[in-house]
Interface confidence: medium
Amino acid sequence: RRGAPAEDQDCGRLPDFIAKLTNNTHQHVFDDLSGSVSLSWVGDSTGVILVLTTFQVPLVIVSFGQSKLYRSEDYGKNFKDITNLINNTFIRTEFGMAIGPENSGKVILTAEVSGGSRGGRVFRSSDFAKNFVQTDLPFHPLTQMMYSPQNSDYLLALSTENGLWVSKNFGEKWEEIHKAVCLAKWGPNNIIFFTTHVNGSCKADLGALELWRTSDLGKTFKTIGVKIYSFGLGGRFLFASVMADKDTTRRIHVSTDQGDTWSMAQLPSVGQEQFYSILAANEDMVFMHVDEPGDTGFGTIFTSDDRGIVYSKSLDRHLYTTTGGETDFTNVTSLRGVYITSTLSEDNSIQSMITFDQGGRWEHLRKPENSKCDATAKNKNECSLHIHASYSISQKLNVPMAPLSEPNAVGIVIAHGSVGDAISVMVPDVYISDDGGYSWAKMLEGPHYYTILDSGGIIVAIEHSNRPINVIKFSTDEGQCWQSYVFTQEPIYFTGLASEPGARSMNISIWGFTESFITRQWVSYTVDFKDILERNCEEDDYTTWLAHSTDPGDYKDGCILGYKEQFLRLRKSSVCQNGRDYVVAKQPSVCPCSLEDFLCDFGYFRPENASECVEQPELKGHELEFCLYGKEEHLTTNGYRKIPGDKCQGGMNPAREVKDLKKKCTSNFLNPTKQNSKSNS
């Protein structure tokens, strides 16, 4: 289907590309001696980049620091030193640059202040960093300022004293709305959720915290949960892990009405050393990881129903090292329903798994064509592709980047990997899929940094090396053929590739430094590919592609979660611009229902290799430890529930007698005596 990648040799060489790129390569040398650089894009399609360089010398008692701030408004081709706008103040890099949501143009920089000061200091901009206003805070911030997703003028921050502070005017004035706060998050509609400790401290009260909500920025409050260990938001779901009465275990409770009513999730409870983790969530459902007892490094993935209450076991032995540790779980954003992760097998080897139907079934990644199985393979002809992600990076394997996919580069997935029976510690190669993970091909030999430009029209890569580099590689045909371009005669120690988030840009910035005997000088090269893709793409540059197609003869071919989607894809042979305004053209069509479109409802399960749901034997004639909306009530079910997000119509409708399931609510999580509303007067 696609040949092995080729570099430069008779591979559709682009005419005059060196001249075209040379004319569009812009160098900027930063005139300072900084030790670190951080870069942020301000707004979407604005071309504005802020670069903060910091230089720190730890002295015996205090540390001396200096920051410089640079601004570009042409996607990094030119930078202007704007340090004077922040009064040459040292900026605290651990807070980063707090960039406002959407295209608000808002930026907050948190400054370092001297020891005895009453509060912190921030520099605020609301005009894409053209101007900054210095503001002294009435508190010392513990976390970066958090913008409300709905209104970028509303900010919240935690102080080092665990106070919850809110601003309604983009940080000009602040008000402490609550003390003893451990964790705070914005919810929908400018709601703030937060946990508070009642007695000692956040750490000491873990499991005895209260979960509070304010819908009016701190005027009034409602306690929506007690005995809380932690909470999280995912999609339209609010989750809380709640301590059990009897022992030290805790359980997940879920709410879809901002905490007014709660239901106990049908998930295993966990002990002190275990954890829950929301791997992914959308408006339809959630992927939840439940840690195994003991220090195993793995757990189980469960997928929820549309209420977030009933969970189906999705994947066993899912690799997840520790709380806040490493997992390889990756949402492949270039194709609906696709996720990749790693499992830990009995022999402690790590294997990659992929699902194409939102966790319904997992399988190994297909072996790339024309590839050989490595030393990890028992059978040299049968093996699969294994993807390096966060865990490999944390283990300091030679993996410079996690897997990459972009919603507007339909079907494209790029990742480091090895071909065998398990992940190999040998130097990986880079593989690409153009169909959302169904098939793979080796794209580049050895580890590389990579990025997608122009919605997939160009892929750019740079070799991962500890020696200075001066070559960038690019492909205009989804990684089949590669051209090499020498972007500078003076090689640099490469530190990173930067392109505008969203993969719509045609500019790439290569960051690094040159080093002489005593000085290190930061430098960036921005390459604009607009002259490589000279013309705009036309209708005939695209071709139709049915996603998830595995059997073109079958009328259900391409059906995933009850519908199929056909996309227009750029032909590999077309060298043209999708353009900044490119919108993925897709045509959905509904599929007839089958049993695959339903999950088993509460009290039912699917025996292995069966498609029908049967009643769980251990629940027959028993009261169920299950709490719906915190009340005792009858739950009626026919054993099936449509999979969240499934759009099938007609076809099979699993009809069977409706059963009454008597339940006992065993959670006092919503003890009415503990429910109260308070005013902040």
């Epitope: 013309r535 705009n536 036309e538 209708e539 005939d540 695209y542 071709t543 139709t544 049915l546 197609s549 073109p552 391409g558 056909q566 227009l568 919108v583 053209a585 045509q587 069509s589």
Partner: antibody, heavy 126, light 107 residues
Framework: QVQLVQSGAEVKKPGASVKVSCKAS????????MHWVRQAPGQGLEWMGS????????NYAQKFQGRVTMTRDTSISTAYMELSRLRSDDTAVYYC???????????????????WGQGTTVTVSS | EIVMTQSPATLSVSPGERATLSCRAS??????LAWYQQKPGQAPRLLIY???TRATGIPARFSGSGSGTEFTLTISSLQSEDFAVYYC?????????FGGGTKVEIK
């Protein structure tokens, strides 16, 4: 209402060129692709190519490459198809047809041709 | 290019009867198929797009089905005005290609 009106019949000698016009009305001319299809006497339909009136970008069937030129004049909402080095087997009725596909979003790319001109008869004879 | 083959070349049907026309693609075109009707001396008219969706103003007796490589146009009860030539066209890829046509004549 939406319509495409083509120029009148032409009689040409072999080796000559013919230019057929197609005037659009009742819709935004630059918003939809224009296709050209021909039909020889007693034969089926044959797709010749298309033009994006918005950008002027063209796409020709391999068979006509080098002989056909499709252009447009957006100021008068008119598309043109010129066929050169005419042969006797180019005798046919030539149709312009609006593609349902939007030139801006690529939506409806796959929906066919919904409005057709009345056809222009081109006779090539010595 | 994708080759479209229609069968039969001619179909003789009595008024009021059902007519079934076939169209086969040399490779999968998913559901990207259009059907046209052409009467003598007239331009073609779009009947069906997306393999099964009727175009505006097309009577319900016309229906399309199929996906991938096999497609069918069905006229449930032939009226006198339905006797014409019918063409299928794949719109999955460029170049757009038509089938050779099926002539539906009065039996």
């Amino acid at each position: 209402q939406v319509q495409l009106v083509q120029s009148g019949a032409e009689v040409k000698k072999p080796g000559a060129s013919v230019k057929v016009s197609c005037k659009a009305s009742g819709y935004t001319f630059t918003g939809y692709y224009m296709h050209w299809v021909r039909q020889a006497p007693g034969q089926g339909l044959e797709w010749m190519g298309s033009i994006n009136p918005n950008s002027g970008g063209t796409n020709y069937a391999q068979k006509f490459q080098g002989r056909v030129t499709m252009t447009r004049d957006t100021s008068i909402s008119t598309a043109y198809m010129e066929l050169s080095r005419l042969r006797s087997d180019d005798t046919a009725v030539y149709y312009c047809a609006r593609g349902v596909g939007s030139t801006v979003t690529l939506a409806y790319y796959y929906y066919g041709m919904d409005v057709w001109g009345q056809g222009t008869t081109v006779t090539v004879s010595s | 290019e994708i080759v479209m083959t229609q069968s039969p070349a001619t179909l003789s049907v009595s008024p009021g009867e059902r007519a079934t026309l076939s169209c086969r693609a040399s490779q999968s075109v998913s559901s990207n198929l259009a059907w046209y009707q052409q009467k003598p001396g007239q331009a073609p008219r779009l009947l069906i797009y997306g393999a099964s969706t009727r175009a505006t103003g097309i009577p319900a007796r016309f229906s399309g089905s199929g996906s991938g490589t096999e497609f069918t146009l069905t006229i449930s009860s032939l009226q006198s005005e339905d006797f014409a030539v019918y063409y299928c066209q794949q719109v999955a890829n460029y170049p757009r290609t038509f089938g050779g046509g099926t002539k539906v004549e009065i039996k």
